[in-house]
Amino acid sequence: EVEKTACPSGKKAREIDESLIFYKKWELEACVDAALLATQMDRVNAIPFTYEQLDVLKHKLDELYPQGYPESVIQHLGYLFLKMSPEDIRKWNVTSLETLKALLEVNKGHEMSPQVATLIDRFVKGRGQLDKDTLDTLTAFYPGYLCSLSPEELSSVPPSSIWAVRPQDLDTCDPRQLDVLYPKARLAFQNMNGSEYFVKIQSFLGGAPTEDLKALSQQNVSMDLATFMKLRTDAVLPLTVAEVQKLLGPHVEGLKAEERHRPVRDWILRQRQDDLDTLGLGLQGGIPNGYLVLDLSMQEALS
């Protein structure tokens, strides 16, 4: 083992204070006791250490805690967290939401880094499920967090947590994710009245089946076109012209602008032209009058 340089006389650190910002890296290594550092971690974040100096401090903590830092140290890492690797973080056992918040605050305003992703993964696994408080915290820092989870991971979200979800949190979710979230949302909001229910469920409707869309069409909800365009194509196709008209209310005229885009395009192809004409929007491409419509999906199911 290489012999360590001795601490110069009078430079031994008695506390973590601002005098240390003027220490050279080797002086920090030689003059700062790791145990002292661990007990006064909350001070480190208030002192403008250079990145090189933070490397030294991290090294000292790594030597003191080779199996992973205790939560008392983790909670006060501050900017030192940015120096941690995913491998370092995998050694941690983070159970306090306050610790999670403190570390997310350090990374605030930046993309979710591999370190943060690992931290969240460790935290959620430790808790066993994505509870409301955790989801509240994560979506506050990373609005797209929910949509970064796999359908399997989303299945561990309890319906009660859905109350924490804001519309923008679902912006990047794909249909597979919404398929998992929608039933949870339906359960969570089931005791709300019609208009309030629709406001809450609207963001999740990309996972709604046909029968739920049919039910909504009977409630004068006036769905906007942006929401309609995010519905599952297979859920929209069986809807009648009358049902779509009721579902969209005054927004029905927006179908004209979207007639070449899914799911509107595919839906038009399934409707009788006569029925489409009743909308007075000039929608073209429906089934001509006199043609017989076979429900091939039913035929396949019977054979």
Partner: antibody, heavy 116, light 110 residues
């Protein structure tokens, strides 16, 4: 016990010069940054200058930059402030203080009066 | 005008809690630590709080500091007559490369 003792204040005419000193004891002077802070009569605190342990970088308030110079002699445990081209608005009690980010010890101050 | 903004005065009766605010910006309080200083009439300032919320030894725990975003506050609970003084907040300013103080708050014990 940490002690900071300022000296060198007095009455000086506008355009004149003064050199303040601050003798430090009770701590390892060469390890710590030092600062000068002033307070005009009846007014609030105003930071003037700061100097790290090795005198590497020196920091000044805009109001004194180019006129005041901070220095230190670690062998004598002493901090200095050379003040040139003094103006009436420089009239204040001048304190030396330990550190540059949180002033944990202060001297009792020395009064500088700039008047004709 | 001071870079950090403090109310010019605050008051309370003995035993009450008084809070003093200090508002800065993303170049001073935002990334840097805040300190609070007490100046009794006719004396040099004294460090009361450092690193946002730490108390030097000898400072009663009636004094507490906190920081959130670009603002900080000093709370004095169980106000006493000897707390009548001027209180200043201070922080390093990364843009100015210098230390900045608030204008000071005069605390009066009624």
């Amino acid at each position: 016990e940490v002690q900071l003792l300022e000296s060198g204040g007095g009455l000086v005419q506008p355009g004149g010069s003064l050199r303040l000193s601050c003798a430090a004891s009770g701590f390892t002077f060469s390890n710590y940054a030092m600062s000068w802070v002033r307070q005009a009569p009846g007014k609030g605190l105003e930071w003037v200058s700061g100097i790290p342990p090795d005198s590497g970088s020196k920091y000044y308030a805009d109001s004194v930059r180019g006129r005041f110079t901070v220095s230190r002699d670690n062998s004598k445990n002493t901090l200095y402030l050379q003040m040139n081209s003094l103006r009436a608005e420089d009239t204040a009690v001048y304190y030396c203080a330990k550190n540059m980010l949180s002033f944990d010890y202060w001297g009792q101050g020395t009064l500088v009066t700039v008047s004709s | 005008q001071s870079v950090l903004t403090q109310p010019p005065s605050a008051s309370g009766t003995p035993g009450q809690r008084v809070t003093i605010s200090c508002t800065g910006s993303s170049s001073n309080i935002g990334p840097n630590a805040v300190s609070w200083y007490q100046q009794l009439p006719g004396t040099a300032p004294k460090l009361l709080i450092y690193y946002n919320s730490k108390r030097p030894s000898g400072v009663p725990d009636r004094f507490s500091g906190s920081k959130s975003g670009t603002s900080a506050s000093l709370a004095i609970s169980g106000l006493r007559s000897e707390d009548e003084a001027d209180y200043y907040c201070g922080s390093w300013d990364s843009s100015l490369s210098g230390y900045v103080f608030g204008g000071g708050t005069k605390v009066t014990v009624l």
